[in-house]
Interface confidence: medium
């Protein structure tokens, strides 16, 4: 039988009455246009909703927006448009919400054509009050908060000026002209690229990379011949044009651009691109596009310096620059990533890694599913996950895969079971062990969200017809109950729950349509009475992550350590609560060769765990640039995988090689850099 229809499915008692008492409708006195929703702060219950409506007139477009505020997780809303003087807010800038619990909000207003600058509305008290501020420039981008100090803002102007405020947007100062891209780094540092000649586009590949660590008092040029730059974890990357031709290479710095090393990655031509797929303080996943319009490339994983890269996955699906990739970090289990590859026959297949890119495999076929028409062998096939690429191709996939750090092991995604992704209508699958095993959870496409750190999963069917039913599960998707939240169905537009999956409230957004008008409406359902009691110790069970063979002493060892979690029993219907903290217990593993990657000049032959010297580099000067200086590189052929905590075990010692090398690209070396002060 289908999931949720089994005899042993325990019903939640009297849930209709409990939910009916906790369902709150709000009809917005608004013509239907567009709506955007932002949460202000964490666990504050404050939501801002901005509705905008465009009336196309003959000569121009007339716009109207309204701002609403809730402080009870969306149960009630108050129209606060008067706090922003009934001004039309530009939706393309969204609502700039400050980091952490700063309570800061910046809204960017639409201004008339002749004005000398833009206008913003600022709040530092979770949108209770707003201050109007006229800007000395027209903003091109949304205001960006410094991650370290929410009073520090930066913005680019339509004239390519870099503007900074030190008092939360009250006063602004232009610190540099001719700026293409600017980003906050750590410690209130700003990195930005500048052009010298015509424009950002014209100077692409001839840009300069600058840094200021004092909000524009002084500057340092840290790179030239720059195509683009990016920040990931503790790494600063620059894509740099080669001296001789139109190719470019990645250079990396771990000291904010003071010193650079050439990344041991293939160079790319004009039509190709690099993309940082994921980065943390330990390592980086880098995609390098293949030459030609192939739609795929190669994933490389870095060492702890961001310099030496190991080939991780071939034929990785990634359409043109800024296009679509299915690369997904499964945040509910350490080391797990899912992505898609384009196979030789142009079919798309899903791959998963459990060890941070060390090995990729297909997803195991769900127990309760049959192989579809794409499968050559009806008994052997895999699960294939729909993500960004499927959504971009307008397949019937309403949502990307979902995982949450505090809902340990849970992954929810649309998928199909066969030899490749199918264009047929997908079903929804769930994994409760971080992607090792999967079960069909719901028939057909759905919107879904996780509440109470995994204690509740909520879903709504994806349909073109109006809906009035929501489904929920208290046992990680095994059994489902349905609840009719309104008599009058609505055209559903989205599910909204507080980021972090700790809340027990879900808001269902949509609009009603009558002969005369259409209006925005939201229904907020609080599940607190479904989970009547707080969870106790007996409600949790020990779970060893990455476990594949419970008797094996090395079971669960990933990146040199294993972790045991206290997880809620599926049969327990109780509240984890807003203060729930994931209880995990790490323990160190013995080292194996799999805990090491091959250092520069070495590689692993297929099906061998030993690193051997690359034959083409034997006896050659290596094109390797370490900190931009001529020096010898010593290596024993192995380097511990970033973030690996193993101890003892094998210690791959071999004689230390002295790899003599030449610097092929030293234009990012320290002596080429210069400083100036304002």
């Amino acid at each position: 039988s289908a999931p949720g229809e089994d005899e042993e499915c325990g019903r939640v008692r009297d849930f209709v009455a409990k939910l009916a008492n906790n369902t709150h409708q709000h009809v917005f006195d608004d013509l239907r246009g567009s709506v955007s929703l932002s949460w202000v702060g964490d666990s504050t219950g404050v939501i801002l909703v901005l509705t905008t409506f465009h009336v196309p007139l003959v000569i121009m477009t007339f716009g109207q927006s309204k701002l609403y505020r809730s402080e009870d997780y969306g149960k009630n809303f108050k129209d606060i448009t008067d706090l922003i003087n009934n001004t039309f807010i530009r939706t393309e800038f969204g609502m700039a919400i400050g980091p952490e619990n700063s309570g800061k909000v910046v809204l960017t207003a639409e201004v008339s054509g002749g004005s000398r600058g833009g206008r913003i509305f600022r709040s530092s008290d979770f949108a209770k009050n707003f201050v109007q501020t006229d800007l000395p420039f027209h903003p091109l981008t949304q205001m960006m908060y410094s991650p370290q100090n929410s009073d520090y803002l930066l913005a680019l102007s339509t004239e390519n000026g870099l503007w900074v405020s030190k008092n939360f947007g009250g006063k602004w100062e232009e610190i540099h002209k001719a700026v293409c891209l600017a980003k906050w780094g750590s410690d209130n540092t700003i990195f930005f690229t500048t052009y010298a000649n015509g424009s950002c586009k014209a100077d692409l590949g001839a840009l300069e990379l600058w840094r200021t660590s004092d909000l524009g008092k002084s500057f340092k040029t840290i790179g030239v011949k720059i195509y683009s730059f990016g920040l990931g974890g503790r790494f600063l990357f620059a894509s740099v044009m080669a001296d001789k031709d139109t190719t470019r290479r990645i250079h990396v710095s771990t000291d904010q651009g003071d010193t650079w090393s050439m990344a041991q990655l293939p160079s790319v031509g004009q039509e190709q691109f690099y993309s940082i797929l994921a980065a943390n303080d330990d390592m980086v996943f880098m995609h390098v596009d293949e030459p030609g319009d192939t739609g795929f490339g190669t994933i490389f994983t870095s060492d702890d310096r961001g310099i030496v890269y190991s080939k991780s996955l071939d034929r990785h699906l990634y359409t043109t620059t800024g296009g679509e990739t299915d690369f997904t970090n499964v945040t509910s289990l350490r080391g797990v990533y899912i992505t898609s590859v384009l196979s030789e026959d142009n079919s798309i297949q899903t791959m998963i890694t459990f060890d941070q890119g060390g090995r990729w495999t297909h997803l195991r076929k769900p127990e309760n599913s049959e192989c579809d028409a794409t499968a050559k062998n009806k008994n052997e096939c895999s699960l294939h996950i729909h993500a960004s690429y499927s959504i971009s191709q307008k397949l019937n996939v309403p949502m990307a895969p979902l995982s949450e750090p505090n809902a340990v092991g849970i992954v929810i995604a649309h998928g199909s079971v066969g030899d490749a992704i199918s264009v047929m209508v997908p079903d929804v699958y769930i994994s409760d062990d971080g992607g090792y095993s999967w079960t069909k959870m719901l028939e057909g496409p759905h919107y879904y969200t996780i509440l109470d750190s995994g204690g509740i999963i909520v879903a709504i069917e994806h349909s073109s017809r109006p809906i009035n039913v929501i489904k929920f599960s208290t046992d990680e998707g095994q059994c489902w109950q349905t609840y009719t939240f309104t008599r009058d169905p609505i055209y559903f537009t989205g599910l909204a729950s507080e980021p972090g999956a700790r809340s027990m409230n879900i808001s269902i957004w949509g609009f009603t349509e009558s002969f005369l008008t259409s209006q925005w409406v939201s229904y907020t359902i609080d599940f607190k009475d479904i989970l009547e009691r707080n969870c106790e110790e007996k409600d949790y069970t020990i779970w060893l992550a990455h476990s594949t063979d419970p008797e094996d002493y090395e079971d669960g060892c990933i990146l040199g350590y294993k972790e045991q979690f206290l997880r809620l029993r599926k049969s327990s219907v109780c509240q984890n609560g807003r203060d729930y903290v994931v209880t995990k217990q790490p323990s160190i593993c013995l080292c194996s060769l799999e805990d090491f990657l091959c250092d520069f000049g070495y590689y692993r032959p297929e099906n061998d765990s030993k690193c051997v010297e690359q034959p083409e580099l034997k006896g050659h000067d290596l094109e390797f640039c370490l900190y931009g200086r001529e020096e010898h590189l010593t290596t024993n052929g192995y380097r511990k995988i970033p973030g690996d905590k193993c101890q003892g075990g094998v210690n791959p010692v071999r004689e230390v090689k002295d790899l003599k090398k030449k610097c092929t690209s030293n234009f990012l070396s320290p002596e080429k850099q210069n400083s100036k002060s304002n």
Partner: antibody, heavy 118, light 107 residues
Framework: EVQLVESGGGLVQPGGSLRLSCAAS????????MSWVRQAPDKRLEWVAI????????YYSDTVKGRFTISRDNSKNSLYLQMNSLRAEDTAVYYC???????????WGQGTLVTVSS | DIQMTQSPSSVSASVGDRVTITCHAS??????IGWLQQKPGKAFKGLIY???NLKDGVPSRFSGSGSGADFTLTISSLQPEDFATYFC?????????FGQGTKVEKR
């Protein structure tokens, strides 16, 4: 019944060698890590060495590193400790112990006494 | 190395008494601690793993608590067969280390 039986202990002179064995029965030996732990005359316990289930990986305490070698023969359900360059301070009762992924010292043998003395 | 400091070194108690033994780790070890029982002429017996989990077959009068660096073994009502020496062991990091032991003897 899960059982571990140590043997091979005895009196040996400083600088001498000894090989301890541990015979396992009642469980799938090849899926468990195994440790040697010793108890000195003052009753203090010291973990000596561990070997992974397949025998590929080993780890030693600093006090025995370079002198002792832990090994196993899964076909014989046996664990070994080769002790070289023995010192007076190595005198102890030596126990073998089983380690699962969940619990590191869940089954113990009765121990075998090693005395290093001239 | 992580030092495990166990106290007291010995305790005199009678049948029916509540006995508490503590172990302090020199650095945080999450819950990677086990408690062992040793009786003269018998093999060591594992009682508790992961700080709080009772090994199968161990009477429920034994319990463990604590997390981080401070841990406790409690015998809620001492029975005649519980007179023995008890050791804590940490297995968060190599080298694994043991407490000095606590001897529970008859008063």
């Amino acid at each position: 019944e899960v059982q571990l039986v140590e043997s091979g202990g005895g009196l040996v002179q400083p600088g001498g060698s000894l090989r301890l064995s541990c015979a396992a029965s009642g469980f799938t030996f090849s899926t468990y890590g195994m440790s040697w732990v010793r108890q000195a005359p003052d009753k203090r316990l010291e973990w000596v060495a561990i070997i992974s289930s397949g025998g590929s990986y080993t780890y030693y305490s600093d006090t025995v590193k370079g002198r002792f070698t832990i090994s196993r023969d899964n076909s014989k359900n046996s664990l070994y400790l080769q002790m070289n360059s023995l010192r007076a301070e190595d005198t102890a009762v030596y126990y073998c112990s089983r380690s699962s992924s969940h619990w590191y010292f869940d089954v113990w043998g009765q121990g075998t006494l090693v005395t290093v003395s001239s | 190395d992580i030092q495990m400091t166990q106290s007291p070194s010995s305790v005199s108690a009678s049948v029916g008494d509540r006995v508490t033994i503590t172990c302090h780790a020199s650095q945080g070890i999450s819950s990677n601690i086990g408690w062992l029982q040793q009786k003269p002429g018998k093999a060591f017996k594992g009682l508790i793993y992961h700080g709080t989990n009772l090994k199968d077959g161990v009477p429920s009068r034994f319990s463990g608590s604590g997390s981080g660096a401070d841990f406790t073994l409690t015998i809620s009502s001492l029975q005649p067969e519980d007179f023995a020496t008890y050791f804590c062991v940490q297995y968060a990091q190599f080298p694994y280390t043991f407490g000095q032991g606590t001897k529970v003897e008859k008063r």
